[in-house]
């Protein structure tokens, strides 16, 4: 049957800076079609078990699927289709009126050059010197890739890394992010208690590991020289990192303009879209170049900050220069200055 499991089936993800996340488009019959999220009897707000799209991610040379659900911003320059039957089947599809279609979004992991362990080694006290030392990032709630608590395994000894705020460890963090195929270090994640109470409902593999490590050499260039084993601490911080390769990235759109290539910048926080407030850290055009690229438009023609005379104007704020560096957006509940961006339109 014609479905995304067919070996010749072609899909692509558009409207994002990454080939591994975006609006799902499929090749069917005589061209590319955007898939509506109302397909297969779903509601336009329904999120799916992403594992059902693993074949699509695989074919795009991406990692495992992270999310499958409404893309929330719908661009419909070409045809859009609603499909019926089983999820992932394209045997029975019909063209949809563009204004009725909410596009389907898919986020897959960025491809990894080497695959870090997907499950933790069993806790044991017998070292296995033959197994190479390795790292794993355990995602915190929110499940982001390339963000979380660092765990180090030497043989089958594994545990978290004790971390003191005064430790000068920038080189080490860059080394760790790089080793995890996650780019470079962005920042430490908020304090995580190593000795936190175990949730009785938490699965066994997420319980605290039996040993802990301490930073031994913050300028190390191979993993075996970075840490030494210590007695597990009952309290204190553990090393939790955010690396530049984190996913999913913040999505942006331009609204209120005469085309999809101009308008007030909005960003998505979870399922909600809101205006992006002007930030002093983004005075250059770099941020807007990135926004234009995400809309699949040309480079920035102009951008202007709109006056925020209204004390009740609200929005979201990114403290970094580029949106792709924003792990989380901050709410601004007053005096949000919106930004109107005009990008070059590739199809004027």
């Amino acid at each position: 049957r014609l479905s995304w499991y067919d070996p010749d089936f072609q899909a692509r993800l558009t409207r994002s800076n990454s080939k591994c996340q975006g609006q799902l488009e499929v090749y069917l019959k005589d061209g590319w079609h955007m898939v509506c999220s109302q397909s297969w009897g779903r509601s336009s707000k329904q999120w799916e078990d992403p594992s059902q799209a693993s074949k699509v991610c695989q074919r795009l040379n991406c990692g495992v699927p992270l999310s499958l659900g409404p893309f929330l911003v719908t661009y419909t320059p070409q045809s859009s289709i609603i499909c019926y039957g089983q999820l992932g089947s394209f045997s029975n599809c019909s063209h949809s009126r563009n204004d009725m279609c909410h596009s389907l979004g898919l986020t897959c992991l960025e491809p990894q050059k080497t695959t870090p362990p997907t499950t933790r080694p069993p806790p044991t006290t017998t070292p296995e010197p033959t197994a190479p030392p390795r790292l794993q990032l355990v995602a915190q709630s929110g499940g982001q890739h390339c963000a979380g608590v660092v765990e180090f395994y030497s043989g089958s000894l594994g545990g978290t890394i004790s971390y003191e705020a005064q430790d000068k460890t920038q080189d080490l963090e860059n080394f760790l992010c790089n080793n995890l195929q996650c780019g470079s270090f962005l920042k430490h994640l908020p304090e995580t208690e190593a000795g936190r109470a175990q949730d009785p409902g938490e699965p066994r593999e997420h319980q605290p590991l039996p040993i802990q490590w301490k930073i031994q050499n913050s300028s190390c260039t191979s993993l075996e020289h970075c840490f030494r084993k210590i007695k597990p601490q009952k309290s204190g911080r553990v090393l939790a990192l955010l690396c530049s390769g984190f996913q999913p990235k913040v999505q942006s759109r331009l609204v209120g303009g005469s085309s999809i290539c101009e308008g007030t910048v909005e960003v998505r926080q979870g399922a909600q879209w809101a205006a992006l407030c002007d930030s002093s850290s983004a005075r250059s055009s770099l941020r807007w170049e990135e926004v234009c690229r995400e809309q699949q438009c040309g480079s920035v023609n102009s951008y202007r900050v709109l006056d925020a005379g209204d004390p009740t104007s609200r929005g979201l704020f990114c403290p970094h220069q580029k949106l792709s560096q924003c792990h989380e957006l901050w709410e601004r509940n007053s005096y949000c200055k919106k930004v109107f961006v005009t990008c070059q339109d590739p199809n004027p």
């Epitope: 014609l2 010749d8 089936f9 072609q10 090749y27 019959k29 005589d30 061209g31 394209f90």
Partner: antibody, heavy 120, light 106 residues
Amino acid sequence: EVQLVESGGGVVQPGRSLRLSCTFSGFSLSTSGMGVGWIRQAPGKGLEWVAHIWWDDDVYYNPSLKSRLTITKDASTDTVYMELSSLRSEDTAVYYCVRRRATGTGFDYWGQGTLVTVSS
Amino acid sequence: NIVMTQSPSSLSASVGDRVTITCQASQDVGTAVAWYQQKPDQSPKLLIYWTSTRHTGVPDRFTGSGSGTDFTLTISSLQPEDIATYFCHQYNSYNTFGSGTKLEIK
């Protein structure tokens, strides 16, 4: 084994209509993802896509020929028909029946072709 | 309509030569490109689809590459049975073909 056989070619006068048939075997147009269409080749010239019909009765026509073209299928007899009206001399060509899959794998099987000559 | 400009229109090569035929699309067609071989008095045969995927039974001396607007068909070591006319085909938006490249043996 996939096979497509065209029939209905010959000499036709300008202004008249023409109906070509394509009978196929080795696959079914009731199978989702399958399509059958027509491509023509003027003597000594290149290839021009004419029309296509899919398993679900969806049809696609070459925009420059659309006003004169009709493509239909009879899934029960594994036959596709193409009717071209108001024939002119530039419609003289070998007309090939082709199979195509909806996943975009090219025109993967071709008939041997039938020659249509438009002449008074 | 998307125009596919194929070059050269004809070429002469020796057995064992590496032969390259190119096609340029008038606008971005992604990777939705196929290549066909047509021998004299025969119907065309599909060689390659989605730019680089060989059709069943096609020898591995035929390879396709490219994306966007520029595409190439390469025959790594020309054989006598490869004498034919080769056509490119874009199917990103409807279907259009290149004008063909006639390949002869020196």
